[in-house]
């Protein structure tokens, strides 16, 4: 988790002088509770946005937006703590909006936004906005939390972000797999424009099971430049096992930007449909 290396972060708006500060995620109002605290945020929304760094890289970011409730507690609102928790690693990053002037009611509802938390493809986050000061231990909570699921690199907009491109998202191998005679599979796919090797991983399964009955790995050497974007054709020999008929073919590239952790593409060949055996027709029709 990190903040986009952007120009100075701003939270000021007409009628409010505000500054964005790094936060330890432990505001001192926990330690020094106040008697009067503001109410919780209203209508917290988190959306996927995209932002460029100063270097020109494109990253997915969490766009956080919320409004204030129209009650008198805004007189005691000193700012907000924005917290993003990455579920799988329990990493948390916080920033603090520090209000340098008092809020006043005005003709429209106060609205705040922040779009500088960089998020990772295919990850889940808990976003919390805490109004400051935080409540006394038994006080009503004044935060709102929402979960935010970032799409993976298959998503059209995500595909062109720097982290996805680094993992090989622009390569579309367009895999085709056909079953040949004599227990063979013919795998065909389009090579990328990089002189790097590939691995074909074949895993076979029985009709209705998830435990593999055959595994095979086939190495494809790095293509020459004139072979870039051409189709590569490989014939794999299957083990002659009755019922070991569902085949998953996975192609793993080893691009320089992602090494052994590049996005893989796969195709599956299902077991052949078993025709319903019809009733046998007798050679002659009995007369009785």
């Amino acid at each position: 988790l990190r903040l986009l290396d952007h120009r100075a972060l701003v939270c000021s708006q007409p009628g409010l002088n505000c500054t964005v500060k790094n936060s330890t995620c432990l505001d001192d109002s926990w330690i020094h509770p106040r008697n009067l605290t503001p109410s919780s945020p209203k209508d917290l929304q988190i959306q996927l946005h995209f932002a460029h760094t100063q270097q020109g890289d494109l990253f997915p970011v969490a766009h956080i937006e919320w409004t204030l409730q129209t009650d008198a507690s805004i007189l005691y609102l000193e700012g907000a703590e924005l917290s993003v928790l990455q579920l799988n690693t329990n990493e948390r990053l916080c920033v603090r909006f520090e209000f340098l002037s008092k809020l006043r009611h005005h003709h429209r509802r106060w609205r705040f936004t922040f779009s500088h938390f960089v998020v990772d493809p295919d990850q889940e986050y808990e976003v919390t906005v805490h109004h400051l000061p935080k409540p006394i231990p038994d006080g009503d909570p004044n935060h709102q939390s929402k979960n935010f699921l970032v799409p993976d690199c298959e998503h059209a907009r995500m595909k062109v972000t720097t982290p996805c491109m680094s993992s090989g998202s622009l390569w579309d191998p367009n895999i085709t797999v056909e079953t040949l005679e004599a227990h063979q599979l013919r795998v065909s796919f389009t090579l990328w424009n990089e002189s790097t090797h590939y691995q074909i991983l074949l895993t076979s399964f029985p009709h209705m099971e998830n435990h593999s009955c055959f595994e095979h790995m086939h190495h494809i050497p790095a293509p020459r430049p004139e072979e870039f974007h051409q189709r590569s054709n490989v014939t794999l020999t299957l083990r002659n096992l009755k019922g070991c008929c569902r085949h998953q073919v996975q192609i793993q590239p080893f691009f320089s930007s992602c090494l052994n952790d590049c996005l893989r593409h796969s195709a599956t060949v299902s077991c052949p449909e078993m025709p319903d055996t019809p009733e046998p027709i007798p050679d002659y029709m009995p007369l009785w």
Partner: antibody, heavy 118, light 107 residues
Framework: EVQLVESGGGSVQPGGSLRLSCAAS????????MNWVRQAPGKGLEWVSI????????HYADSVKGRFTISRDNAKNSLYLQMNSLRDEDTAVYYC???????????WGQGTTVTVSS | DIQMTQSPSSLSASVGDRVTITCRAS??????LAWYQQKPGKFPELLIY???TLQSGVPSRFSGSGSGTDFTLTISSLQPEDVATYYC?????????FGPGTKVDIK
């Protein structure tokens, strides 16, 4: 000292219910997601459920989905697992576990035993 | 869902031997993998996270490597106190599945 202590295990008949608790101490409980993990007798570890720090994200293993409910009370530093429609295969030692910042689970309770049997 | 497999399911080695346990994910999980040691009758203990980062307090004879789908836990010189079952766990996305375990004992 960072500590997790589970309680609430016991014997129950198939179809019955139990509520497990996990009391946390020695760390800022409200800053952490929390997990339940179980281990059937003589078997391996099975991840059961996770709840995020503010309860806005909850996930379950397919084997318990629709029967188990994870919850937490940050004011009480407590994690819970409500287990309904219990089956024989739910017999296990249940651990609560705290995730480490960076990944994995670095703090575990001593476990509480749940036995489902008629 | 992503399946986790471990091999071997059990092994016997002599004190001082180099021991290697492998863990494979059915799809790529980047480096979101942890290794645990569980001694009989005890709760599991975290050995390694992020595929190769040693948890503090864990002896340096333990090491982890790998990324994507194939991961390895290595004990460079097996000690009597290393007799245990070792589990890998993926945590790229829920469900945070464990591998079936590898039981290690001394010859």
């Amino acid at each position: 000292e960072v500590q997790l202590v589970e309680s609430g295990g016991g014997s129950v008949q198939p179809g019955g219910s139990l509520r497990l608790s996990c009391a946390a101490s020695g760390f800022t409980f409200s800053s952490y997601s929390m997990n339940w993990v179980r281990q059937a007798p003589g078997k391996g570890l099975e991840w059961v459920s996770i709840i995020s720090s503010r309860s806005s994200i909850i996930h379950y293993a397919d084997s318990v989905k629709g029967r188990f409910t994870i919850s937490r009370d940050n004011a009480k530093n407590s994690l819970y697992l409500q287990m309904n429609s219990l089956r024989d295969e739910d017999t296990a030692v249940y651990y609560c576990a705290r995730p480490k910042v960076g990944g994995g689970m670095d703090v575990w309770g001593q476990g509480t035993t749940v036995t489902v049997s008629s | 869902d992503i399946q986790m497999t471990q091999s071997p399911s059990s092994l016997s080695a002599s004190v001082g031997d180099r021991v290697t346990i492998t863990c494979r994910a059915s799809q790529g999980i980047s480096n979101y993998l942890a290794w645990y040691q569980q001694k009989p009758g005890k709760f599991p203990e975290l050995l390694i996270y992020a595929a190769s980062t040693l948890q503090s307090g864990v002896p340096s004879r333990f090491s982890g490597s790998g990324s994507g789908t194939d991961f390895t836990l290595t004990i460079s010189s097996l000690q009597p106190e290393d007799v245990a079952t070792y589990y890998c766990q993926k945590y790229n996305r829920a469900p945070f599945t464990f591998g079936p375990g590898t039981k290690v004992d001394i010859k």
